[in-house]
């Protein structure tokens, strides 16, 4: 994860907007380490926000925040919440590992210190909006966004959104029980409901989940998530990835000359992003669970872009 460009200027002024500003303390000044007598975004409004348009979806791993000084006063944001969006219209509040309560981040305690808050799980978004909830004197901010993949090839390819249809998701087998079917099409990130994941008929390392993109895609990462019944956590700890152009001949993903064993989930709810380096150019993708807790259970998203987007 690297700085996305607030401090460097890679993120340009027009990409930074806000609900309002105090005097000349404009949104475009909200850049980590920015110096001068007016060197941050600031506002007196009680319900304010500052928004960054990254121009393309990014994986955002964290945010570094800093306050500012005005004469003898320390101005800073001590607590804030984060909202994010892929399209700028539909916004989600960042909740971390929780499905219920929103996550309140603890920010700065003075005007010069840098506080690094990590997003676990990471945020996949084009737009990110910070809403101050507690502040000293005025909401005042200099910041940097930490993330990766500025080539805009970290788009969710459609597992969660259902742009990838049920018919495109298949598996070696799936588990059915009375009134519950854990079919491949249930393997969608953040899916809710009774049987809200893919589970194979039996738990062994020969099982797989397959996605057919229906055309060649550049796959740069996968996000995996387990599932929890009332009392039982089920998730995949380790998995392999294989790919195919024709659906018949499969190649396992190698890194540094050997089959890459991906480190998956450590609980049933936190999405874990694994990047593919080098990226895969493939039509078909398979996940092969290798170790798991209680049962193999998988919800997932595939990250990437259309192959022709590269040219």
């Amino acid at each position: 994860q690297t700085p996305l460009g607030m401090a460097s200027g890679h993120i340009r002024d027009f990409q930074i907007t806000a609900s309002g500003q105090y005097g000349q303390w404009a949104p475009k000044l909200a850049r980590l380490h920015y110096s001068g007598s007016i060197n941050a975004w600031s506002t007196k409004e009680p319900f304010s926000w500052i928004k960054v348009d990254l121009l393309a979806p990014m994986i955002i791993h964290g945010i570094k925040t800093q306050g500012a000084r005005q004469k003898f006063s320390s101005l800073y944001i001590s607590q804030f919440i984060i909202m994010y969006s892929l399209d700028g219209k539909k916004w989600q509040t960042y909740r971390g590992n929780s499905t219920g309560t929103l996550m309140v981040f603890f920010g700065n305690v003075d005007s010069s210190g840098i506080k690094h808050n990590i997003f676990n799980p990471p945020i996949i978004a084009r737009y990110i909006r910070l809403h101050p909830t507690h502040y000293s004197i005025r909401s005042t901010l200099r910041m940097e966004l930490m993330g990766c993949d500025l080539n805009s090839c970290s788009m969710p390819l459609g597992m969660e959104s259902k742009a990838i249809s049920d018919a495109q998701i298949t598996a070696s087998s799936y588990f059915t029980n009375m009134f519950a079917t854990w079919s491949p099409s249930k393997a969608r990130l953040h899916l809710q409901g009774r049987s809200n994941a893919w589970r194979p008929q039996v738990n062994n390392p020969k099982e797989w989940l397959q996605v057919d993109f229906q055309k060649t895609m550049k796959v740069t990462g996968v996000t995996t998530q387990g599932v929890k019944s009332l009392l039982t956590s089920m998730y995949v700890k380790e998995f392999l990835i294989s790919s195919s152009q024709d659906g018949h001949q499969w190649t396992l993903f190698f890194q540094n000359g050997k089959v890459k064993v991906f480190q998956g989930n450590q609980d049933s709810f936190t999405p874990v992003v694994n990047s593919l380096d080098p990226p895969l150019l493939t039509r078909y993708l398979r996940i092969h669970p290798q170790s798991w807790v209680h049962q193999i259970a998988l919800r997932m998203e595939v990250l990437g872009c259309e192959a022709q987007d590269l040219y």
């Epitope: 059915t176 009375m178 009134f179 519950a180 009774r194 009332l230 039982t232 089920m234 049962q295």
Partner: antibody
């Protein structure tokens, strides 16, 4: 925490009906199916049937078809099992249970139904 | 409908010994659908194993399950005084659910 609390013991005459309740707490009734298991005194476990409060669908054991009805009141999170045309060999402890995730991980405390003239 | 037969009917062992309980099905089915329960007098059954070999939450690792097809086994590696009870195998799944008749594990 997740709990199933059943109604109290019942004494019924042959030919009568009995309705046993199972109140769930710690989750919403529609999240999981409810299974019912009977156990005659000194005997083994016998599956009576299963009910899905979400769809209203039920599956009954062959031996109980025609004499059992399973229902639920989702507004109060209570599942019910009604046995009709009771006979003395229906005397048993009846348990409600829910699958978590697959087998019966959570059980009620049991309701003793005695059928006696 | 699949019938399950448990053996032995009664097993007499001492604390510290190993117990092996058998469950045989009248026809083959996926091990994904086999469970084992423990029941003590006056109590509801308690799930030990599901999917033939997966321990339920909070079950000590001295309990293990194995088997496939028609033959399934519950093993208690080292008996503790609280393990003496009746054990039932169960076939669950998409249709009828059946239980074995039970194995009584008693102190020798």
């Amino acid at each position: 925490q997740v709990q199933l609390v059943q109604s109290g013991a019942e004494v019924k005459k042959p030919g009568a009906s009995v309705k046993v309740s199972c109140k769930v707490s710690g989750y919403t009734l529609t999240e999981l199916p409810v299974h019912w298991v009977g156990q005659a005194p000194g005997k083994g476990l016998e599956w009576v049937g299963s009910f899905d409060p979400e769809s209203g669908e039920s599956i009954y054991a062959r031996e109980f078809q025609g004499s059992v009805t399973m229902t639920a009141d989702t507004s109060t999170d209570i599942a019910y099992m009604e046995l009709s045309s009771l006979r003395s060999d229906d005397t048993a402890v009846y348990y409600c249970a829910v699958p978590d995730p697959d087998a019966f991980d959570i059980w009620g405390q049991g309701t003793m139904v005695t059928v006696s003239s | 409908e699949i019938a399950l037969t448990q053996s032995p009917g009664t097993l007499s062992l001492s604390p510290g010994e190993r117990a092996t309980l058998s469950c045989r099905a009248s026809q083959s089915f996926s091990s994904s659908y086999l469970a084992w329960y423990q029941q003590k007098p006056g109590q509801a059954p308690r799930l030990l194993i599901y999917g033939a070999s997966t321990r339920a939450t909070g079950i000590p690792d001295r309990f293990s399950g194995s088997g496939s097809g028609t033959d399934f086994t519950l093993t208690i590696s080292r008996l503790e005084p609280e393990d003496f009870a009746v054990y039932y195998c169960q076939k669950y799944g998409t249709s009828a659910i059946t239980f074995g008749q039970g194995t009584r594990l008693e102190i020798k």
